[in-house]
């Protein structure tokens, strides 16, 4: 058993049929010695008396808020949560496996630049009695500070018969060094509590590996005289790290016909313009990627040819 | 050429070669994300690698103030990786394919380090750790780790030279 926060405790349970329960001794936080009784949750039934209460925790029915009283007055509370371990593996019932980029990916994180700011998100089908707490650091043995905000519900989607809820959190490295080569990964830890079930999820990454620039901005076409060619121009997204002479992007320009089956013409360039042939009813799209490190491409920015 | 003690490197040449290094490093180990190498116990392998750190002056302001600190750090790293790529980690079993970009990568590391430090001038170099994995699979894992680490290193070096070429070239 360990303390998650004040008056909230997590009991770690081996979850197999013939596992013995976990013996927990609750102590009433009071100088009083006599006349103390214990209750669970909203029930007024007395579970025991005395300054300590010894319980066996084996099921979710044994978890909850234990309260000690004296003469009708509440003295202290202890909320017990359960963390299940099945076949030596901690349960992951609360969050959905996003399976990208690999199985058992519960947390996904992205950064728009090298400023040390990043966003993580996760999915669940649970709609109520759900709380999240996020902590992060750079490195684990001698951790350096990363400050995370509160996790918020960022999207709701219908998937078949189920509703899916997306939560996200923004974090910022306290003393980020955008130009340095990272040697210690960022660690992100999410505590998830659903009713009386506790679970924790972790992710470890370098900012450089989760970079995904915003799409290029101000995408414009300039027809070239007496030609089917157009000059496409664009700018670095506002959110990208500066100066651009240091934090450079590379770009992919694509000409795509109306039909998805039509052949796509692609051009790669480090410049912020390119000359392409504009076909009727086609569209021109541009996306960006870090020039020197192959992290994710941005989403496409597009304009129609006409 | 960068003469230790103050003169500027051939920024544009360094830029071109460092960008080529980036391309080669990624073609040598393109499978990003397919193998989480940090789960495989890095300690003895990549802790000794020279990293370009915050105080090394490789940020735009640091380069403007005095690029020599940063260039020395980059030079150290290039020599370090050049030695690693020439060691039995890469020359031993399992053999690299004849068309593997590792050979080109090795030569380019050497080329860039010589651009930064001509013969007769010496910056102190870092000792290469004695890594001699016994099993072929350990060697394979070590190669992946070294290449991943090299990708990060050459990305920072390429940024430095691109910025130098754009803002510090005479």
């Amino acid at each position: 058993i360990w303390e998650l926060k004040k008056d909230v405790y997590v009991v770690e349970l081996d979850w197999y049929p013939d596992a013995p329960g976990e013996m927990v001794v609750l102590t009433c936080d009071t100088p009083e010695e006599d006349g103390i009784t214990w209750t669970l949750d909203q029930s007024s039934e007395v579970l025991g008396s005395g300054k300590t209460l010894t319980i066996q925790v084996k099921e979710f029915g044994d978890a909850g808020q234990y309260t000690c009283h004296k003469g009708g007055e509440v003295l202290s509370h202890s909320l017990l949560l359960l963390h299940k371990k099945e076949d030596g593996i901690w349960s992951t019932d609360i969050l959905k496996d996003q399976k990208e980029p690999k199985n058992k990916t519960f947390l996904r994180c992205e950064a728009k630049n090298y400023s040390g700011r990043f966003t993580c998100w996760w999915l669940t089908t649970i709609s109520t009695d759900l709380t999240f707490s996020v902590k992060s650091s750079r490195g684990s043995s001698d951790p350096q500070g990363v400050t995370c905000g509160a996790a918020t519900l960022s999207a709701e989607r219908v998937r078949g018969d189920n509703k899916e809820y997306e939560y996200s959190v923004e974090c910022q490295e306290d003393s980020a060094c955008p130009a340095a080569e990272e040697s210690l990964p960022i660690e992100v830890m999410v505590d998830a509590v659903h009713k009386l079930k506790y679970e924790n999820y972790t992710s470890s990454f370098f900012i450089r590996d989760i970079i995904k620039p915003d799409p290029p901005k101000n995408l414009q076409l300039k027809p070239l005289k007496n030609s089917r060619q157009v000059e496409v121009s664009w700018e670095y997204p506002d959110t990208w790290s500066t100066p651009h002479s240091y934090f450079s992007l590379t770009f992919c320009v694509q000409v795509q016909g109306k039909s998805k089956r039509e052949k796509k013409d692609r051009v790669f360039t480090d410049k912020t313009s390119a000359t392409v042939i504009c076909r009727k009813n086609a569209s021109i799209s541009v996306r960006a990627q870090d020039r020197y490190y192959s992290s994710s491409w941005s989403e496409w920015a597009s304009v129609p040819c006409s | 050429r960068a003469v230790p003690g103050g003169s500027s490197p051939a920024w544009t040449q360094c830029q071109q070669l460092s960008q080529k290094l980036c391309t080669l490093a990624w073609s040598a180990h393109p499978l990003v994300g397919h193998m989480d190498l940090r789960e495989e116990g890095d300690e003895e392998t990549t802790n000794d690698v020279p990293h370009i750190q915050c105080g090394d002056g490789c940020d735009p302001q640091g380069l403007r103030d005095n690029s020599q600190f940063c260039l020395q750090r980059i030079h150290q790293g290039l020599i370090f990786y050049e030695k690693l790529l020439g060691s039995d980690i890469f020359t031993g079993e399992p053999s690299l394919l004849p068309d593997s970009p590792v050979g080109q990568l090795h030569a380019s590391l050497l080329g860039l380090s010589q651009l930064l430090q001509p013969e007769g001038h010496h910056w102190e170099t870092q000792q290469i750790p004695s890594l001699s994995p016994s099993q072929p699979w350990q060697r394979l894992l070590l190669r992946f780790k070294i290449l991943r680490s090299l990708q990060a290193f050459v990305a920072v070096a390429a940024r430095v030279f691109a910025h130098g070429a754009a803002t510090l070239s005479p």
Epitope: D18, L40, S43, L47, T54, E59, F60, G61 | -
Partner: antibody
């Protein structure tokens, strides 16, 4: 006052189905798991299993798994034990009981339902 | 599963006497043992839980002791209404199991 009131005695033929009930009152039904115990004529007590009224999480005695089904209806604070095909060997007194949280033993018992299976 | 063996199977005693019933587990169950009393035609009634804790409303002449594999129910001074069948139960490991019972009869 905590009370568990069970349905009346049943006489059935082999192969028939049956569902007996246990209605709880005097406490918060969803805060306590409900269990069932069998007592064959002249014999001792046998633990069938327990069930959570919150999410219908069940722990069966392997000896009874597949033989009986436990269920609950939260809206009526009622627990059920059912058979799809009775056998003569199912003849027994069946007790429902409330599981004490933080312990696991049964602190309050129903009065029992006698099930007789005979051709 | 854990087997609980009660002894004696039948205990003959007189009102006012001290009665002791033993319960032995086939493996350790900590202190997670309960004792129940059952009178003819009635449902069992909880007496003792966690080996030695008296259930609310049960007279103080009933007491329990033991831990691990050996447990004892003691009735310090028998009253006429105490003559019944007594069962021990372990609730440490599923499936929870009962002893075969001890019949306490009037000598």
């Amino acid at each position: 006052e905590v009370q568990l009131v069970q349905s009346g005695a049943e006489v059935k033929k082999p192969g028939e189905s049956l569902k007996i009930s246990c209605q709880s009152s005097g406490y918060t039904f969803t805060s306590y798991w409900i269990g069932w115990v069998r007592q064959m004529p002249g014999q001792g007590l046998e633990w069938i299993g327990i069930m959570s009224p919150v999410d219908s999480d069940i722990r069966y005695n392997p000896m009874f798994r597949g033989q009986v089904t436990m269920s609950v209806d939260k809206s009526s604070s009622t627990a059920y034990l059912q058979w799809s095909s009775l056998k003569a060997s199912d003849t027994a007194m069946y007790y429902c009981a409330r599981r004490r949280p933080g312990q696991g033993y049964f602190d309050f018992w129903g009065q029992g339902t006698m099930v007789t299976v005979s051709s | 599963e854990i087997v609980l063996t009660q002894s004696p199977a039948t205990l003959s005693a007189s009102p006012g006497e001290r009665a002791t019933i033993s319960c032995r587990a086939s493996q350790s169950v900590g202190t997670w043992v309960a004792w129940y009393q059952q009178k003819p035609g009635q449902a069992p009634r909880s007496l003792i839980y966690a080996a030695s804790n008296l259930q609310s409303g049960i007279p103080a002449r009933f007491s329990g002791s033991g831990s691990g594999t050996d447990f004892t129910l003691t009735i310090s001074s028998l009253e006429p209404e105490d003559f019944a069948v007594y069962y021990c139960q372990q609730y440490n490991i599923y499936p929870y199991t009962f002893g075969q019972g001890t019949r306490l009869e009037i000598k």
